[in-house]
Amino acid sequence: EEELQVIQPDKSVLVAAGETATLRCTATSLIPVGPIQWFRGAGPGRELIYNQKEGHFPRVTTVSDLTKRNNMDFSIRIGNITPADAGTYYCVKFRKGSPDDVEFKSGAGTELSVRAKPSAPVVSGPAARATPQHTVSFTCESHGFSPRDITLKWFKNGNELSDFQTNVDPVGESVSYSIHSTAKVVLTREDVHSQVICEVAHVTLQGDPLRGTANLSETIRVPPTLEVTQQPVRAENQVNVTCQVRKFYPQRLQLTWLENGNVSRTETASTVTENKDGTYNWMSWLLVNVSAHRDDVKLTCQVEHDGQPAVSKSHDLKVSAHPKEQGSNTAAENTGSNERN
């Protein structure tokens, strides 16, 4: 007569995270009396998953009614699978015994592999802004995926980047994995509207990769170019000097006028115009009463952009040809004017 056999027909089972795993097991006999138990792993450290005899196993349901007479199907379903459930599951027949049931025969085991989707990639850029022609690093991270095989690509405005390094951790076997990649990007003056994209492809995503983005507007600083020009005389003793601040980003900018090195007026860029490339232009003017000056006047437009050291541009105003007028103002209010490039 043949002794009871425990049959686990599936060598492996693959389940997506969040779904239900069915682990199949049948016995060839009702003899001996005693429960079936399911374990994850083997040896003394094995984890009890289900015991037909006793206990509470809220995630486990039996496929068939084990109270039914002549039942020899001991298959179970485990709900809400997570990567932590991965492992080899054994269906084990015990023989009723005192004081404890005795292990009688084990099935060959079923390896449960869990397919888990990667988390949405998170792209982060440098802590400080950088200027065009500089190389900056972006990192991309995604976690919690299984199996380990994964593909990561970097793009800048749709163009694939090649200068990046990627690591998948851990190197050995694990219930789930993480990916970390660092890409190097050379900034250009046109990058205010640019995007860096990290794209992750995994078997669980069915060909629809996940993307994480970073806007270079949060990384780039485009310093302004300055031009100071003298406008035609508006009145007999007045000269209009303009300072055109072009192609800067971000908008945070403070402009100071100096007359012969002395501060005349300070103002903050407000009504700016935006260029197609995302940079800004701004213009400030100074109305100089030349009759108040005996000598030539050196006018300086000094700009402090985004907390960086000030840049300036000067203009020499010739006053020798103009008669002097005592006590008159040397500067008039500026009225904002804009120029679009």
Epitope: E1, S29, I31, V33
Partner: antibody, heavy 115, light 111 residues
Amino acid sequence: RQLVESGGGLVQPGGSLRLSCAASGFSLSSHGISWVRQAPGKGLEYIGTIGTGVITYYASWAKGRFTGSKTSSTAYLQMTSLRAEDTAVYYCARGSAWNDPFDYWGQGTLVTVSS
Amino acid sequence: DIVMTQSPSSLSASVGDRVTITCQASQSVYGNNDLAWYQQKPGQAPKLLIYLASTLATGVPSRFSGSGSGTDFTLTISSLQPEDFATYYCLGGGDDEADNTFGQGTKVEIK
């Protein structure tokens, strides 16, 4: 589906008897066969269960004098050193208890131990 | 060995009555549910009614029900029928596979 016992009868004290339990309609290979007896006018008494070769067990009082065996179609109970108090109707039943209860029973065979 | 004590040993009841028979084990039965109930009529073999303390055997009328766990168990016949007059036995299993013991029986007679 039924079990049919045979082999009962009159036996002298100290004698031996072999009871048979033939299954029809199902195989015994995946089932235990248990033996239960009932003395005249008394209650039921569990004797033991015959499973596969190594899985055979008996109530403490029956060990040594009662031994069982089975094929895929017939189970046997060998009884030795019989005593007057062994007089009873002997039943075979399919099952091993717990989740494998005694669901099919034979009609019983009377064993009388008397000189 | 496990000892099963049934009560009452006999009872008289009428058709339509609700009948309750109890069975007490000297120790917890195996798995807290290794308890079956059998019905036996004169000159016949026993018949399985309930197993695993509360599972109704195939073909058994639903007026029979079993309950209990550990050491105390009950067989209830919700509405006694003429064919239910018989002797009822509980069978309890201890932790050892050979430790199976019947109660002494409860005879249900017509009042």
